[in-house]
């Protein structure tokens, strides 16, 4: 048995851009004021982190300037966003939660979202 | 402050039953998941039993060695969790401490079980 | 079931040194590790929580790092008040294992 539940899609499609989006729910056991929340992306047996941000219930998420995520939080979900995605980027991504403060500190990994990623096809020459 | 007072422990012959308590102060309790962890020369630190609270329904999880001997439960009025510990055995002995998280301990109460 | 082996299981090292204290899990376990210091006598202590975050009211001298299946905590210029036995913890899933413990003393 995991420890917080942490719920996520199991499959996203990213867009044309390379534009993935999917909201990460967690349930609290108390009330949380500091949450962390990672991006985790497992390819084969290899777990690397895409970004993290630490946020106060009620404000927005800060993620640092050349980060590839955005999101927003709304009470105990979080919709996150990662750009820039290639079709080499296809795989499962995994969210994380720790509720920081106050404590305990409680932790939560969701089962990961299958993203995947379609590199648009160029565009033909047209003569006109 | 956060206090975690545990009371119960003491002698007790193998096969018998002992109720342990733990009071809790300066802390959210319906807030929290509650755990039992136990100290014994032999096997260091081990965790026996967790009760989480009301948004996880107050499911409980336990240790392989103690499941259906040993009973946790909660009352939020009262701050208090307990462990019931049915048909106590030689290897129950220990220091058993009352978590809040595993943030939070207490002082810890031994339990000695010898005929 | 997620199993933490620690080590060294005792480790005697001099005031002022630094030393370094090893966790393997049998699977990875996503930071959620905790390390708890037990002096003789007293209850255990949270020291460090998802792996690498300074409990409340414990000394800068200690430090978390580690992902996946390693951690490590590492004491900075050893004090005689670190004498104590050192605990992970698997926080990630039950049943919430601990490792062996290493037993610190100063030389």
């Known amino acids: 048995c995991k420890a917080m539940h942490v719920a996520q899609p199991a499959v996203v499609l990213a867009s044309s851009r390379g534009i993935a989006s999917f909201v990460c729910e967690y349930a609290s056991p108390g009330k949380a004021t500091e949450v962390r929340v990672t991006v985790l992306r497992q390819a084969d047996s290899q777990v690397t982190e895409v970004c993290a941000a630490t946020y106060m219930m009620g404000n927005e998420l800060t993620f640092l300037d050349d980060s590839i995520c955005t999101g927003t939080s709304s009470g105990n979900q979080v919709n996150l966003t990662i750009q820039g995605l290639r079709a080499m980027d296809t795989g499962l991504y995994i969210c994380k939660v720790e509720l920081m403060y106050p404590p305990p500190y409680y932790l939560g990994i969701g089962n990961g979202t299958q993203i995947y990623v379609i590199d648009p096809e160029p565009c033909p020459d047209s003569d006109f | 402050e956060v206090k975690l007072d545990e009371t119960g422990g003491g002698l007790v012959q193998p096969g018998r039953s002992m109720k342990l308590s733990c009071v809790v102060s300066g802390f959210t309790f319906s807030d929290n998941w509650m755990n039992w962890v136990r100290q014994s020369p032999e096997k260091g630190l081990e965790w026996v039993a967790q009760i989480r609270n009301k948004p996880y329904n107050f499911e409980t999880y336990y240790s392989d060695s103690v499941k259906g001997r040993f009973t946790i439960s909660r009352d939020d009025s009262k701050s208090t969790v307990y462990l019931q510990m049915n048909n106590l055995r030689a290897e129950d002995m220990g220091v058993y401490y009352c978590t809040g998280g595993f943030t939070y301990w207490g002082q810890g109460t031994l339990v000695t079980v010898s005929a | 079931d997620i199993q933490m082996t620690q080590s060294p299981a005792s480790l005697s090292a001099s005031v002022g040194e630094t030393v370094t204290i090893t966790c393997g899990a049998s699977?990875?376990?996503?930071?959620?590790l905790n390390w708890y210091q037990r002096k003789q006598g007293k209850s255990p202590q949270l020291l460090i929580y998802g792996a690498t975050n300074l409990a409340e009211g414990m000394s800068s001298r200690f430090s978390g790092s580690g992902s996946g299946r390693q951690y490590s905590l590492k004491i900075s210029s050893l004090h005689p008040d670190d004498v104590a036995t050192y605990y992970c913890?698997?926080?990630?899933?039950?049943?919430?294992?601990f490792g062996g413990g290493t037993k610190l003393e100063i030389k």
């Open positions: 699977e990875n376990i996503y930071g959620g």
């Open positions: 913890q698997n926080v990630l899933s039950s049943p919430w294992t």
